[in-house]
């Protein structure tokens, strides 16, 4: 793993414990909470990050209209079960034996049930819409500058292949970033759009997961982009299954 050899830290995940106990004395890093070894040359999976977070001490373009099947993460934090690859297990349960099914980004996609609830497969989230509202500025950002900087951010900071950033929409003060990644498109080694979106969300909230100086300083032609509100919509390859009671609530 390419953790920094000189001081043995994980550049892409500060929620780790690192020590030079890998092969040949190489630096090896393990995620807090799960103890799983992580690859510090890329993003850590959202499941392992959530688990680490729960273990840590408490502290004229038209905009896209989310589909009726789009999910928003209203349930907030929970301590997830991750598979040996660090992905979310399809079924998640809490300490009181309440269970539910989640998608590949860990967002609930069914009503809550009991231990008899079956989740046959982990349904892939193939389309993520990140909806941002920025603080008023003297003038609107230039759309092409904003587009270029956001694409550069996802490419260089989150190591997401440019083909997965489908579009950047802008109608001051709303910015929308569309990420698309079908199962068939995702090759071995590709960063998952769900992981990139989670790192971005934490960055935007001033809770950077990267080692370093602890904050995303995103600028468009020198002007800081100050995000006042973030909403993230998740679209799954198979629509979610909620009861009519929830849909009409």
């Amino acid at each position: 793993h390419t953790a920094a050899q000189d001081n043995c830290t994980c550049p892409t995940n500060k929620m780790t414990v690192c020590s030079p106990d890998g092969p040949g004395g190489r630096c090896q890093c393990r995620a807090l909470g799960s103890g799983m070894a992580v690859d510090c040359s890329t993003l850590t999976s959202k499941c392992l990050l959530l688990k680490a977070r729960m273990s840590a001490p408490k502290n004229a373009r038209t905009l896209v209209r989310p589909s009726e099947h789009a999910l928003v993460d209203n349930d907030g934090l929970y301590d997830p079960d991750c598979d040996p690859e660090g992905r979310f297990k399809a079924r998640q349960c809490n300490q009181t034996s309440v269970c539910w099914c989640v998608n590949s980004v860990g967002v609930r996609r069914t009503d809550k049930g009991d231990l008899s609830l079956r989740c046959d497969e982990l349904v892939r989230t193939h389309h993520i819409l990140i909806d941002l509202r920025h603080r008023p500025t003297a003038g609107a950002f230039n759309h092409s500058d904003l587009d270029a900087e956001l694409r550069r951010l996802f490419r260089e900071r989150y190591r997401l292949h440019p083909k997965f950033v489908a579009a950047v929409h802008y109608e001051q003060p709303t910015i929308q970033i569309e990420l698309r990644q079908n199962t068939s498109q995702k090759a071995a080694g590709d960063v998952d759009i769900g992981d990139a979106a989670y790192y971005f969300e934490r960055d935007i909230k001033g809770e950077s997961l990267f080692q370093g100086r602890g904050g995303l300083d995103l600028r468009v032609r020198g002007e800081p982009l100050q995000v006042e509100r973030t909403l993230i919509y998740y679209l799954d390859e198979i629509p979610p299954k909620f009861s009519m009671k929830r849909l009409t609530a």
């Epitope: 603080r135 001033g206 602890g214 904050g215 300083d217 995103l218 020198g222």
Partner: antibody, heavy 119, light 112 residues
Framework: QVQLQESGPGLVKPSETLSLTCTVS????????VNWIRQPPGKGLEWIGV???????NYNSALMSRVTISKDTSKNQFSLKLSSVTAADTAVYYC?????????????WGQGTLVTVSS | DIVMTQSPDSLAVSLGERATINCKSS????????????LAWYQQKPGQPPKLLIY???SRESGVPDRFSGSGSGTDFTLTISSLQAEDVAVYYC????????FGGGTKVEIK
């Protein structure tokens, strides 16, 4: 490791153009930008301008009409040009790396080069 | 343009005593989204380039002794050296990066 080194003529005549080069190593010019800062003898620091990693530039409004910053990726160099110089432009000129999305802090500086404007 | 005003211009403090430098900006440096202040402190010794000490107003740069601390938010900021050492004799500058960059005028710290 990250290194920056300023170079250029130590003496420039009034009304001429001051040209300096910042040669960098240990990082990619497409991932990081570079700032230019100057310091007149015995005085404080003055920010001149920046070329961001994305290639756009911003300049100090007081110097904007006279300043140009550019880069040559193939040579790992950033350059500063300041036109129509006067004695007031005599200073130590520094280049410093922009820390990209990690905050606009200047954690890496060159040693600086003294430029004297005199006939 | 944002104006940064430092005080005092110079400061003489006995070894082991506390040194306090103030910096005031002409507008708020707080990013409302990340709740971080775009303010840094630098130390410059004669014949050397400045050295980053503090960023985000209160975060200490790696390798900087813990006797250096930064505080404040919005428009008023402070750099404190809790117990002055001989090697701390230098000029200290605050710098805003909220709207491009501006340095304060500097504060010279000497031993009394």
């Amino acid at each position: 490791q990250v290194q920056l080194q300023e170079s250029g003529p130590g003496l420039v005549k009034p009304s001429e153009t001051l040209s300096l080069t910042c040669t960098v190593s240990g990082f990619s010019l497409t991932s990081y930008g570079v700032n230019w800062i100057r310091q007149p003898p015995g005085k404080g620091l003055e920010w001149i301008g920046v070329m961001w990693a994305g290639g756009s530039t911003n300049y100090n409004s007081a110097l904007m009409s006279r300043v140009t910053i550019s880069k040559d990726t193939s040579k790992n160099q950033f350059s500063l040009k300041l036109s129509s110089v006067t004695a007031a432009d005599t200073a130590v000129y520094y280049c410093a790396r922009d820390e990209n999305w990690d905050g606009a802090w200047f954690a890496y500086w060159g040693q600086g080069t003294l430029v004297t404007v005199s006939s | 343009d944002i104006v940064m005003t430092q005080s005092p211009d110079s400061l003489a403090v006995s070894l082991g005593e506390r040194a306090t430098i103030n910096c005031k900006s002409s507008q708020s440096l707080l990013n409302s989204g990340t709740r971080k202040n775009y303010l840094a402190w630098y130390q410059q010794k004669p014949g050397q380039p400045p050295k980053l000490l503090i960023y985000w107003a209160s975060s200490r740069e790696s390798g900087v002794p813990d006797r250096f601390s930064g505080s404040g938010s919005g428009t008023d900021f402070t750099l404190t050296i809790s117990s002055l050492q001989a090697e701390d004799v230098a000029v200290y500058y605050c710098k805003q990066s909220y709207n491009l960059f501006t340095f304060g005028g500097g504060t010279k710290v000497e031993i009394k």
